[in-house]
């Protein structure tokens, strides 16, 4: 049986930001029409990464395996029926949760990104590193960044490729 | 609400295995008491990540997010109740996907490993790095090695901390 | 001691079929994955096929894809070879090979072979 | 579909002395490659898996090196009982034997 992971263009672009690698970055982008002032944004949260070395790039790969794969990304079934289930979360629509996180990311505040991300049971050091990252992506970041990420994610979001 | 991630302490040993690092993957695998011929076989497997580089655990890393969060990690809810749902898919257990790419990691062919990778849509790119990293392991395990990482995986799959 | 014996070789008009067997002994059949090589007369080995362990995954080469069949029965140690559409190019001696428990390596013990003829 | 070629086709060599036989993948294949002994009228024997692992009971006269697209088995001290043809095998896609090459005994 062939399956259909959810949104791949979304873990594309992640895991180009989080691995450093520019021209990898650009080329996940270019597929979804990002402009320019969307591609600086990317990069600015990338460089976090760079400076941030190795480890956090493993950490918040860590991160983004745990929501990906947990009970919520796995459809509220208890709430649900089975056509709803099928309808809501079996498409190849980007998780609830992880979309949380990334625009908590975004737009919070380190404490209440840090705070979504200890709900998945995190090390002390993946939440340390969840911390370093985000602070520098606010240090980095201006508002305007913050709108040309979000401009991207909705076209990632909402792109045939997820 | 609190959610429980799907058997977190795997993806602590995968993420520390695919890192590099070998302190962090002594730490997870003292947790689930695992012996020395045990922690001997994950460093072989470690010890393929280190020498294919950073775009080697970047790559992995991107299929074990992708098989995490593909459709049938979610349940087949199309065929299950939401009772079943609820039992089945929504606890702490590893999703079988996530095990029989582990398994054929470990037992299959490379053509076999690869032939799974790539019913996740993956990338050119990440279909030969998963070919290179399952040569390496093949290359460096003996019939021993892999029985003591089965052994260690069962350890993990039935780990409280699973 | 680890014994492949193949059988049901002979000589076959170009369009017929051949079923091939290998008997194995002396280890544990179902924890290994199997292989069958040829080798054309005076000619190199050439491998054309191999089958997982639980028999769920099979892979051919090129030149016997779509007319050669590989198989397994667990229960009787056997391996199987059905060869349909026969070549005269397919005149060769037919070994089967088993590889390491989870895949250590390719082809550590062979059978001695059976000899396979097409020709009109 | 990868190719793998031998060199030389036919080696003769004296008692003793050093055998070299080569074998190159048309691509990288890391370190799946595996060498084979194939006496007249027997089946193929397993001298050295992976490049350069030794498989039990192969005498200490047979070595292999190399990685990615090029390897080598060495005879270290050829003996009468060496003649034979040797076969190197990649299992990194599929698998895919190389021609062949002869060793005659001087």
């Known amino acids: 049986v062939k399956m259909a992971e959810t949104c791949p263009i979304f873990y594309d672009v992640f895991f180009a930001v989080a691995n450093g690698n520019e021209l990898l970055l650009d080329l996940s982008l270019t597929k979804v029409n990002a402009t320019e002032p969307e591609r600086t944004a990317m990069k600015k949260i990338q460089d976090c990464y760079v400076e941030n070395g190795l480890i956090s790039r493993v950490l918040d790969g860590l991160v983004m395996t745990t929501i990906s794969s947990s009970k919520d990304c796995m459809g509220e079934a208890v709430q649900n029926t089975v056509e709803d289930l099928k309808l809501n979360t079996l498409g190849r629509e980007i998780c609830p949760a992880v979309k949380r996180g990334v625009d908590l990311f975004l737009t919070g505040t380190p404490d209440e990104y840090v705070e979504q991300v200890a709900q998945y049971k995190a090390l002390p050091v993946v939440l340390e590193n969840a911390r370093i990252l985000k602070n520098c992506v606010d240090a980095k970041m201006t508002e305007e960044d913050k709108e040309n990420a979000l401009s991207l994610l909705d076209k990632i979001y909402t792109s045939p490729l997820c | 609400v609190k959610m429980a991630e799907t058997c977190p302490i795997f993806y602590d040993v995968f993420f520390a295995v695919a890192n590099g690092n070998e302190l962090l993957l002594d730490l997870s695998l003292t947790k689930v008491n695992a012996t020395e011929p045990e922690r001997t076989a994950m460093k072989k497997i470690q010890d393929c990540y280190v020498e294919n580089g950073l775009i080697s655990r970047v790559l992995d890393g991107l299929v074990m997010t992708t098989i995490s969060s593909s459709k049938d990690c979610m349940g087949e809810a199309v065929q299950n109740t939401v009772e079943d749902l609820k039992l089945n898919t929504l606890g702490r257990e590893i999703c079988p996907a996530v095990k029989r790419g582990v398994d054929l990691f470990l037992t299959g062919t490379p053509d076999e490993y690869v032939e799974q990778v790539a019913q996740y849509k993956a990338l050119p790119v990440v279909l030969e790095n998963a070919r290179i990293l399952k040569n390496c392991v093949d290359a460096k395990m003996t019939e021993e090695d892999k029985e003591n990482a089965l052994s260690l995986l069962d350890k993990i799959y039935t780990s409280p901390l699973c | 001691e680890v014994q492949l014996v193949e059988s049901g070789g002979g000589l076959v008009k170009p369009g017929g079929s051949l079923r091939l067997s290998c008997a194995a002994s002396?280890?544990?059949?179902?924890?290994?994955?199997m292989n069958w090589i040829r080798q054309a007369p005076g000619k190199g080995l050439e491998w054309i096929s191999y089958?997982?362990?639980?028999?769920?995954?099979?892979y051919y080469a090129d030149s016997v894809k779509g007319r050669f069949t590989i198989s397994r029965d667990n229960a009787k140690n056997s391996l199987y070879l059905q060869m349909n559409s026969l070549r005269a190019e397919d005149t060769a001696v037919y070994y089967c090979a088993r590889d390491g428990k989870y895949n250590t390596v390719a082809g550590d013990h062979w059978g001695q072979g059976t000899l396979v003829t097409v020709s009109s | 579909e990868i190719v793998m070629t031998q060199s030389p086709d036919f080696q003769s060599v004296a008692p003793k002395e050093k055998v070299t036989i080569t074998c190159r993948a048309s691509?990288?294949?890391?370190?799946?490659l595996h060498w084979y002994q194939q006496k007249p009228d027997q089946s193929p024997k397993l001298l050295i898996k992976?490049?350069?692992q030794s498989f039990s009971g192969v005498p200490s006269r047979f070595s292999g090196s190399g990685s990615g697209t090029d390897f080598t088995l060495t005879i270290n001290s050829l003996e009468a009982e060496d003649a034979a043809t040797y076969y190197c095998l990649q299992s990194y896609t599929l698998r895919t034997f190389g021609q062949g090459t002869k060793v005659e005994i001087k």
């Open positions: 691509q990288n294949i890391g370190s799946s």
């Open positions: 002396g280890f544990t059949f179902s924890d290994y994955y």
């Open positions: 992976y490049a350069s």
């Open positions: 089958i997982s362990s639980s028999d769920d995954t099979t």
